[in-house]
């Protein structure tokens, strides 16, 4: 059961001093982060008992596992139902406290009633202030029963509930007709889901025999121990003033647990702390009584004395709940109250006993929950005890439950029950997740949802190349960390699987489903360098580069050219998709811009080192195109070009550039400068006979301008092959600019 306690301070002289505290002994309770589950909640539940609205109550968190409710201003604020919710996930548990007004017309003889399925529950409301009207009983706020005021027996109104079932659980109240609901007697009925001494689905399992008023939980068979007792069967008393499943909590204040009501998870309900009784838990137990609500009787024998907190304190030579067992009677020693094993393991369980006559191997036996008796395989005999070792057959889930070690000698017998939890090793429900990949490593998130039981102690990652029959490689990692698989092959698919383990022998679970993870290509390592670049216009740039010569195939798919315009903060990327290319024409650039240029080799998605950068200044945009370009053949090797100057010039033309290209030819065009910008005609010489040529031209001021229209003309026939075209303008020869 969840270790959750709701304490109510019942010193009711001043409601402003009243407080409710919810304490959780669960690991990480109340922290409220995802890792630890939701925080503790403590609130008044107004669904059934509605009280007049008052100022809001104050909630204070004290540390990670305690929450307190204060701010009650008048006694009516206290009346009703309060609940504390704690624990995470399937263990989320609600603890309920029902508060009655001490001045009510009717008062409950006992607030919490825990009964077994099929029992008869009897709720008893004691008359505190008589009224001569009917008494109305309600269940969870709805009408349930009417009693005539004459039906009081011994000053009490009784509600008998025969053959109760779990749905009968809830808040019951008894109220005189016309009286305020705050004058009602409020009760809490808890109906266990099973008959007495049974638990589990179908109620087939036997409860461990909870001692000292502990109540067997109908779902898990654990004893919910009264405040002040601990152990699998509540067999051990805490020191005075302590409570919690491991006696780890201490009652506040100098008077210990006096005046406090303790509410624990169902099916326990609420009671005073050990050693106290009364409606306000302020009365010490009468002699001979002990425990929560002083419900237990000591009945000590053989000179034992009754302690109201722990029961019988035995003189030396005697032991047992009533000091009824002589130390000569055999006694099981130091048996753990709870053991945990993994499914399908074959553990060894030890059971030690002492006594006179001395227990021998055959006198100690182990009984499983299904009644099977195991005999010890060996015994270690020491002067003060005999320890029997039992080899347990392969464990199955049905072995979970209460086992018993029993010792029998002619001096008597003793037995000790202990709980065995058979845990299922965890099995991943999903494949691990790939976080990042490189050519020789994969970064993997291994921890996934799993079936079976935690906690996860280790995570193993198994991996090998896809379709390989070689052995799996294994890496053991911390459950909370990501894993880097290293020294892998580039561009290779790997099958990766997770295996989870929980603590203890046989805690390794089956491997989870595989997933395919592929390493990246190898990184290109060669660094290109820029051979040169050539401005082909105000917006065009031809770039060439080289790579170092290395043996073996080139690792690369192409080149990435990057142009950085620092002024505008813009980057231009040009992809050259052939690894053999060593030149590229970059077009659509911004005239008059200063660019930083570099080139790098790429392979798959990986980039190699960038070349040292070059700085390139593109000329500003030039003048408009020359107008009305016309070509006229003069001979078998000469063609005359005529044109008109461009309009709306931004400045004086420095030269014209003529482009000459054989029509349909595959070679690069030739550029010829006309350095006399005032001219409007020029003769291109050295052409081939009977050859069709294409011409276009542009002007230059600071930068080259737009091209004119293209014109076609053929040289005349019968000439010899010329050496190449040249230009003559007014008989002046000009060189070629390629």
């Amino acid at each position: 059961a969840v270790d959750l306690t709701l304490l109510a301070n019942l010193r009711l002289t001043d409601p402003q001093r009243f407080f409710l505290t919810c304490v959780s002994g669960e690991a990480g309770a109340g922290r409220g982060s995802d890792a630890w589950g939701p925080p503790l909640l403590l609130e008044k539940d107004d669904r059934i008992v509605r009280t007049p609205p008052g100022p809001p109550l104050r909630l204070a968190r004290n540390g990670s596992h305690q929450v307190t409710l204060r701010g009650f201003s008048k006694p009516s604020d206290l009346v009703g139902v309060f609940s504390c919710v704690g624990g995470a996930g399937a263990r989320r548990t609600r603890v309920i406290y029902v508060h009655n007004s001490p001045g009510a017309h009717l008062l409950p003889d006992k607030v919490t009633h825990t009964v077994n399925k099929g029992d008869t529950a009897v709720l008893s409301a004691r008359v505190h202030k008589e009224k001569q009207t009917d008494v109305i009983w309600k269940s969870n706020g709805s009408y349930f029963y009417t009693l005539d005021w004459h039906e009081a027996q011994d000053g009490r109104f009784l509600l008998q509930l025969p053959n109760v079932q779990p749905p009968s659980s809830g808040i019951y109240s008894a109220t005189y007709l016309e009286a305020s609901p705050l004058g009602s007697a409020f009760f809490r009925l808890i109906v266990r889901g099973c008959g007495a001494g049974r638990w589990g689905p179908g109620c087939t399992k036997e409860c461990p025999g909870c001692l000292h008023g502990g109540v067997c939980h109908d779902h898990d068979g654990e004893c919910v121990c009264p405040p002040g007792f601990t152990g699998t069967r509540c067999e051990q008393a805490c020191r005075e003033g302590r409570f919690g499943q491991s006696c780890q909590e201490q009652c506040p204040g100098i008077s210990g647990c006096r005046g406090l009501t303790f509410c624990l998870p169902d099916p326990y309900g609420c009671s005073c702390g050990s050693g106290w009784r009364g409606s306000q838990c302020q009365e010490a137990c009468a002699p001979g009584h002990f425990g929560a609500d002083c419900r237990l009787q000591c009945q000590c024998q053989n000179g034992g004395t009754c302690d109201r907190f722990s029961g019988c304190v035995c003189p030396s030579g005697w032991h047992g709940v009533h000091c009824e067992k002589s130390d000569r009677i055999p006694q099981i020693l130091n048996m753990a109250s709870e053991l945990e094993f993994n499914l399908e393991t074959m553990p060894r369980i030890n059971c030690a006993a002492a006594g006179n006559p001395f227990p021998v191997r055959g006198s100690i036996e182990l009984r499983k929950p299904d009644g099977t008796v195991l005999l010890s395989t060996k015994a270690i005999v020491e002067p003060e005890k005999t320890t029997a070792e039992f080899e347990v057959p392969r464990l199955v889930l049905a072995d979970s439950g209460f086992w018993e070690c029993r010792v029998s000698t002619s001096g008597g017998q003793d037995s000790r029950r202990f709980k065995v939890n058979v845990k299922v090793p965890p099995v991943p429900l999903a494949a691990p997740r790939l976080l990042t990949k490189q050519s020789r490593q994969l970064v993997v998130s291994p921890l996934v949802s799993f079936s079976g039981d935690g906690p996860i102690s280790t995570v193993r990652l198994h991996y090998r190349p896809q379709d390989s029959t070689m052995d799996w490689s294994t890496i053991v990692v911390d459950p909370s960390e990501n894993v880097t698989l290293m020294n892998l092959r580039p561009k290779t698919g790997y099958s990766v699987r997770v295996q989870l383990s929980r603590p203890g022998e046989g805690g390794e679970g089956a491997w989870g489903p595989p997933t395919l993870m592929t390493t990246d290509c190898p990184e290109p390592l060669l660094q290109p360098w820029l051979e040169g670049w050539h401005v082909e216009g105000t917006d065009r740039l031809r770039v060439s580069w080289s790579l170092p010569l290395v043996p073996g195939p080139l690792v690369g798919d192409g080149f990435l050219l990057r142009l950085w315009d620092g002024t505008r903060g813009q980057e231009r990327r040009e992809n050259v998709s052939s690894p053999q290319a060593r030149t590229a024409l970059l077009t659509g650039l911004t005239p008059g811009t200063h660019y930083q240029l570099d080139v790098q080799l790429y392979h798959c998605t990986l980039l190699g080192p960038a070349s040292p950068p070059a700085h390139v200044l593109l000329p500003p945009s030039g003048p408009p195109a020359p107008r009305h370009l016309h070509a006229q053949a003069l001979s078998d090797s000469e063609i005359q070009l005529t044109w008109k100057h461009p309009e709306a010039l931004p400045g004086p033309i420095s030269k014209y550039v003529v482009e000459v290209q054989v029509a349909g030819g595959a070679g690069d065009p030739l550029w010829i400068d006309v350095d006399r910008p005032e001219e409007t005609s020029t003769i291109i010489r050295g052409l081939n006979a009977s050859t069709r040529y294409l011409f276009r031209m542009r002007a230059s001021i600071q930068g080259l301008g737009d091209w004119s229209n293209t014109v076609e003309e053929s040289t005349l026939g019968n000439g010899l092959q010329a050496e190449g075209p040249v230009q003559e303008s007014r008989a002046a020869e000009e060189g070629l600019d390629q």
Epitope: T133, Y145, T146, L147, H150, E178
Partner: antibody, heavy 117, light 110 residues
Framework: EVQLLESGGGLVQPGGSLRLSCAAS????????MGWVRQAPGKGLEWVSS????????YYADSVKGRFTISRDNSKNTLYLQMNSLRAEDTAMYYC??????????WGQGTLVTVSS | QSALTQPASVSGSPGQSITISCTGT?????????VSWYQQHPGKAPQLMIY???KRPSGLSNRFSGSKSDNTASLTISGLQAEDEADYYC??????????FGGGTKLTVL
């Protein structure tokens, strides 16, 4: 839906007897206080008798005390009124009523009892 | 067990408010806050309108309200409607687990 169906009324001579029944449905009969209320023709309502859920305490109006007996059978969800030594002034519509709030909250449609020679 | 005293008749126009009184003694109305009111249309069974002096059964119109002062209880109907025309009876707990009814009031909606 709560339903109460009275039966057993009719014409009876003075000094005679009648047994009225009330069949209940739509609620847990065994938990409720039940009663009979009558209404003489053209007159007001008059409480006759009440019985508590367990069949325990029973109460009667002075006008019927010693002559009428109220009873119930929780296993049959039925309320009864045994009327003996009937008088002309007992002529009325007899209503069966359920009480949840200290007074009748649901009523049947009634059964007419006529005492006449 | 004397009957509680109610006016034989009251009347009002649609939309108006009317009040019906019910006078008892210190042994019944005066001692307990357990007055209930019933509406009865001709030929029909009575229907509970108010209980414990001023509480309304769920689903009943809030035009009906009840109150008590000393030995007199009152039923007020606001926003009178034609379907409110009926006989109205008060009833009080009278101690010793007995009940006493009023003589009834005929409400006429003009």
């Amino acid at each position: 839906e709560v339903q109460l169906l009275e039966s057993g009324g009719g014409l009876v001579q003075p000094g005679g007897s009648l047994r009225l029944s009330c069949a209940a449905s739509g609620f847990t009969f065994s938990r409720y206080k039940m009663g009979w209320v009558r209404q003489a023709p053209g007159k007001g309502l008059e409480w006759v008798s009440s019985i508590y859920p367990s069949g325990g305490p029973t109460y009667y109006a002075d006008s019927v005390k010693g002559r009428f007996t109220i009873s119930r059978d929780n296993s049959k969800n039925t309320l009864y009124l045994q009327m003996n030594s009937l008088r002309a002034e007992d002529t009325a519509m007899y209503y069966c009523a359920r009480s949840e709030v200290g007074a009748p909250d649901y009523w049947g449609q009634g059964t007419l009892v006529t005492v006449s020679s | 067990q004397s009957a509680l005293t109610q006016p034989a008749s009251v009347s009002g126009s649609p939309g108006q408010s009317i009040t019906i009184s019910c006078t008892g003694t210190s042994s019944d109305v005066g001692s307990y806050n357990l007055v209930s009111w019933y509406q009865q249309h001709p030929g029909k069974a009575p229907q509970l309108m108010i209980y414990e002096g001023s509480k309304r059964p769920s689903g009943l119109s809030n035009r009906f309200s009840g109150s008590k002062s000393d030995n007199t209880a009152s039923l007020t109907i606001s926003g009178l409607q034609a379907e409110d025309e009926a006989d109205y009876y008060c009833c009080s707990y009278a101690g010793s687990s007995t009940l006493v009814f009023g003589g009834g009031t005929k409400l006429t909606v003009l």
